[in-house]
């Protein structure tokens, strides 16, 4: 993986752009660790499998996280 030799953070830039939950393949939340001091949110898009880093402080992204967790809780018994 590029850059992994020097640092373990994943995100080089972050995005505030709202993401349509329907276009999401996967959403990963990586908590801060000894390797990377900040929380990272990585969205994998259905289109071409693009991965996009999202801004955890953005209102739109916070709303996305709420929507995704609500969807998950609906699915689980």
């Amino acid at each position: 993986i590029p850059l992994s030799r020097t640092v373990r953070c994943t995100c080089i830039s972050i995005s505030n752009q709202p993401v349509n939950p329907r276009s999401l393949e996967k959403l990963e939340i990586i908590p801060p660790s000894q390797f990377c001091p900040h929380v990272e949110i990585i969205a994998t898009m259905k289109k071409k499998g693009e991965k996009r880093c999202l801004n955890p402080e953005s209102k739109a992204i916070k709303n996305l996280l709420k929507a995704v967790s609500k969807e998950r809780s609906k699915r689980s018994p």
Epitope: V7, C9, T10, Q17, I42
Partner: antibody, heavy 124, light 109 residues
């Protein structure tokens, strides 16, 4: 509008130091990784260094490793390149460039905004 | 270290013609890591394509990118007068971490 403006270039003797600055406006600087890319007279593009949005990720081309240091001050919307032990082969136009929104180690969105460059000449 | 080779070095064409520019990597490159740039004399480069085939914001649809593995292509379907420039491919992911090809100059025949 979205803009990057480089400054700090000039004529310097071999072995001396120089610090370049790049001031950003028109976008949220603290969200974007930033690069320095250089172009020697009549030559192609050469990537120099990258710094992540939070300053944690830093990486350098082999040709400048140990001599150049990339840094940023998000409160001042400014990117820096500290260049020490300068050599004649460092003579070039130095561009700062913005990393695309959301870029990460798995998917690269390219350098989507560039400054107009500042000229560094290393000569005795 | 992955080395990028671009061919031809110079492409002489007329406005309206189709331009096909090649970028070859010395080892396989993920298409997620391949970009193309345009540079005109005295100007900064401009991002055209990222992810091997996705057009950057504001880039006309006459520009398209394709390819995978070691072979990538930038195609300009119909050359406009403003398209005569130098084109660079770039890969991300090995040491040095961002590598540019030597460029292809598209000039007027």
């Amino acid at each position: 509008q979205v803009q990057l403006v480089e400054s700090g270039g000039g004529v310097v003797q071999p072995g001396r130091s120089l610090r370049l600055s790049c001031t950003a406006s028109g976008f949220t600087f603290s969200k974007h990784g930033m690069h320095w890319v250089r172009q020697a007279p009549g030559k192609g593009l050469e990537w120099v260094a990258v710094i992540g949005f939070a300053g944690v990720i830093k990486s350098y081309a082999d040709s400048v490793k140990g001599r150049f240091t990339i840094s940023r001050d998000n409160s001042k919307n400014t990117l820096y390149l500290q260049m020490n032990s300068l050599r004649a082969e460092d003579t070039a136009v130095y561009y700062c460039a913005r990393e695309g929104e959301g870029s990460n180690i798995y998917f690269y969105y390219g350098m989507d905004v560039w400054g107009q460059g500042t000229t560094v000449t290393v000569s005795s | 270290e992955i080395v990028l080779t671009q061919s031809p070095g110079t492409l002489s064409l007329s406005p309206g013609e189709r331009a096909t520019l090649s970028c070859r990597a010395s080892q396989s490159v993920s298409s997620s890591y391949l970009a193309w740039y345009q540079q005109k004399p005295g100007q900064a480069p401009r991002l055209l394509i990222y992810g091997a085939s996705s057009r950057a914001t504001g880039i006309p649809d006459r520009f398209s990118g394709s390819g995978s593995g070691t072979d990538f292509t930038l195609t300009i379907s119909r050359l406009e007068p403003e398209d005569f420039a130098v084109y660079y491919c770039q890969q991300y992911g090995s040491s040095p971490i961002f590598t540019f090809g030597p460029g292809t100059k598209v000039d007027i025949k």
